[in-house]
C-alpha cells in the first residue's frame, strides 16, 4: 500500500490526519513545538490554558450528528444518506497536515487536541464554507439597502429588517405609482409627481446601528445573533 492519499479539486481547508498512538504533529506545528519546549514554564502554562479553551471549543463544534435516510427509510443496513443541506464536502490535501513525530509536552501538562477523522473534518469544512456564503450573502444584501453600503457594521438582523422595510417602501411606491397612473389616465390628476415619493425613500435611510458579531465557525445551539434572527422572524 502507498504512503499517503491525495485530494484533487475543490475544498478550501486542510484534511487533518488522526492522532497516532505515538507522538505526532503537523510539519509547521513541529517547529513551534520545538520552540515551545524551550520556552519558560510560565509561557507553557499560559499556552496550556489557551489550548484547553481551544480544545473545548473544538469539541463543542465536533459533536456527533445523526442523520436520517434520504427518503426516510433505512438505506440498506443503516441510516447513511444525508439530506442535501447537511452534507459536507471533503476538505483538501491531507499531506499538508502530516508530521512524523510529536514532542512530549506531558511535562507541562499540555496535550494537543486529537486530529479529526476525515468525515468530521469534511463536515466542519462544509460548515465553514456555509457560514462564509451566508456572510457573503449578507454583505451583498447590505450593499443594496439604504445606508448599508456606508455602514459595514450593520448586523444581520438589522440588514434583514432594513431590507424588509426597503422592499415594503418600494412596493408602496409602486402601488402609489400605479394609483397615480390610473388617476392620470382617468383624467383626474395633472401629471405632477407625488411629493410622498422622495419622502418615503428618505425615511428609509436612518436604520439603527449596532456592533456586528460574526457567527464564523459557531456551532452553539443559539448565539445571541441567531436568537435575534429568531426574534426578527417573529416580528416579520
Amino acid at each position: 500500500m502507498e504512503s499517503s492519499a491525495k485530494m484533487e479539486s475543490g475544498g478550501a481547508g486542510q484534511q487533518p490526519q488522526p492522532q497516532p498512538q505515538q507522538p505526532f504533529l503537523p510539519p509547521a506545528a513541529c517547529f513551534f513545538a520545538t520552540a515551545a519546549a524551550a520556552a519558560a514554564a510560565a509561557a507553557a502554562a499560559a499556552a496550556q490554558s489557551a489550548q484547553q479553551q481551544q480544545q473545548q471549543q473544538q469539541q463543542q463544534q465536533q459533536a456527533p450528528q445523526l442523520r436520517p435516510a434520504a427518503d426516510g427509510q433505512p438505506s440498506g443496513g443503516g441510516h447513511k444518506s444525508a439530506p442535501k443541506q447537511v452534507k459536507r464536502q471533503r476538505s483538501s490535501s491531507p499531506e499538508l497536515m502530516r508530521c512524523k513525530r510529536r514532542l512530549n509536552f506531558s511535562g507541562f501538562g499540555y496535550s494537543l487536541p486529537q486530529q479529526q477523522p476525515a468525515a468530521v473534518a469534511r463536515r466542519n469544512e462544509r460548515e465553514r464554507n456555509r457560514v462564509k456564503l451566508v456572510n457573503l450573502g449578507f454583505a451583498t444584501l447590505r450593499e443594496h439597502v439604504p445606508n448599508g453600503a456606508a455602514n459595514k457594521k450593520m448586523s444581520k438582523v438589522e440588514t434583514l429588517r432594513s431590507a424588509v422595510e426597503y422592499i415594503r417602501a418600494l412596493q408602496q411606491l409602486l402601488d402609489e405609482h400605479d394609483a397615480v397612473s390610473a388617476a392620470f389616465q382617468a383624467g383626474v390628476l395633472s401629471p405632477t409627481i407625488s411629493p410622498n415619493y422622495s419622502n418615503d425613500l428618505n425615511s428609509m435611510a436612518g436604520s439603527p446601528v449596532s456592533s456586528y458579531s460574526s457567527d464564523e465557525g459557531s456551532y452553539d445551539p443559539l448565539s445571541p445573533e441567531e436568537q435575534e434572527l429568531l426574534d426578527f422572524t417573529n416580528w416579520f
Epitope: 492519499a5 490526519q17 440498506g76 447513511k80 452534507k87 463536515r123
Partner: antibody, heavy 120, light 113 residues
Framework: EVKLVESEGGLVQPGSSMKLSCTAS????????MAWVRQVPEKGLEWVAT????????YYLDSLKSRFIISRDNAKNILYLQMSSLKSEDTATYYC?????????????WGQGTTLTVSS | DIVMSQSPSSLAVSVGEKVTLSCKSS????????????LAWYQQKPGQSPKLLIY???TRESGVPDRFTGSGSGTDFTLTISSVKAEDLAVYYC?????????FGSGTKLEIK
C-alpha cells in the same frame, strides 16, 4: 434494491489507458460518496479513490493520483475510473463501492467487480 | 498511513465452534469527541465481492446474523463468530475509515474443518 454494476474489464497493454464505469441503481446516487477499491489476485483490498456527492472533491491513493481519475455523472447514475499509463501492478479486480459519505466512510454496498489485466 | 494488522492469517475451525479474529491498527481509531471507533469489518466469500458486516467497530449491519459481533476500541479490535456455520467460509477484512488513505487489513481466511 441497491445495485452497483461495473463495466467489463479486460486485457490491456502496459502504458495504455482504460476507463471503468459503474452504474448505480436502487438509491439516490447523488446522496452518496462513491469509491473504487481494488484487489490484486489472491491478495487484500486496496482503496483507490473516493469522490464526493457532486464530484467537486476527489481523493486518491497517493501513488495513483497522477494516473487515475475518478469522476461521476449524477444525471446518469454512473461512476467512472479513468486509468492511464497502466502498469502490470494495476492488474486487479476493481470494485465500485458506495461510501456512506456523511460521518460514515465505510463501504456498505459493493459491485460484483471487474477484472483488469495489464500484460504484454 | 494507518497500518492494519490482522491475525491469524488463516484458521480452520469446526462447525459450531467460536472464532475470534483480531485486528490491530498502528494509530488509534477512536475519536474522543464522539467516542466512535472508525473501523469496519467485511466478509468476502470465494468468488464474491466484499460484504459489510460491522461498522463503528461494533454496530452490526442489518441482515447480518447476530452470531457476528464486533468489539474493541482504540487500536485493538475483534470480530467474534459465536458459532461458526459452513457458510461462514470466507476471508474477513478490517478497514479503517478514520483518515485518508483508507486502509484494510490483509485479511483472515476462515476455513471449515
Amino acid at each position: 434494491e441497491v445495485k452497483l454494476v461495473e463495466s467489463e474489464g479486460g486485457l490491456v497493454q502496459p502504458g495504455s489507458s482504460m476507463k471503468l464505469s459503474c452504474t448505480a441503481s436502487g438509491f439516490t446516487f447523488s446522496d452518496y460518496y462513491m469509491a473504487w477499491v481494488r484487489q490484486v489476485p489472491e491478495k487484500g483490498l486496496e482503496w483507490v479513490a473516493t469522490i464526493d456527492y457532486d464530484g467537486s472533491n476527489t481523493y486518491y491513493l497517493d501513488s495513483l493520483k497522477s494516473r487515475f481519475i475518478i469522476s461521476r455523472d449524477n444525471a446518469k447514475n454512473i461512476l467512472y475510473l479513468q486509468m492511464s499509463s497502466l502498469k502490470s501492478e494495476d492488474t486487479a479486480t476493481y470494485y465500485c463501492a458506495r461510501d456512506g459519505g456523511y460521518d460514515e466512510d465505510y463501504f456498505d454496498y459493493w459491485g460484483q467487480g471487474t477484472t483488469l489485466t495489464v500484460s504484454s | 498511513d494507518i497500518v492494519m494488522s490482522q491475525s491469524p492469517s488463516s484458521l480452520a475451525v469446526s462447525v459450531g465452534e467460536k472464532v475470534t479474529l483480531s485486528c490491530k491498527s498502528s494509530q488509534t481509531l477512536l475519536y474522543s469527541s464522539n467516542q466512535q471507533n472508525y473501523l469496519a469489518w467485511y466478509q468476502q466469500k470465494p468468488g464474491q465481492s466484499p460484504k459489510l458486516l460491522i461498522y463503528w467497530a461494533s454496530t452490526r449491519e442489518s441482515g447480518v446474523p447476530d452470531r457476528f459481533t464486533g468489539s474493541g476500541s482504540g487500536t485493538d479490535f475483534t470480530l467474534t463468530i459465536s458459532s461458526v456455520k459452513a457458510e461462514d467460509l470466507a476471508v474477513y477484512y478490517c478497514h479503517q475509515y478514520y483518515t485518508y488513505p483508507f486502509t484494510f487489513g490483509s485479511g483472515t481466511k476462515l476455513e471449515i474443518k
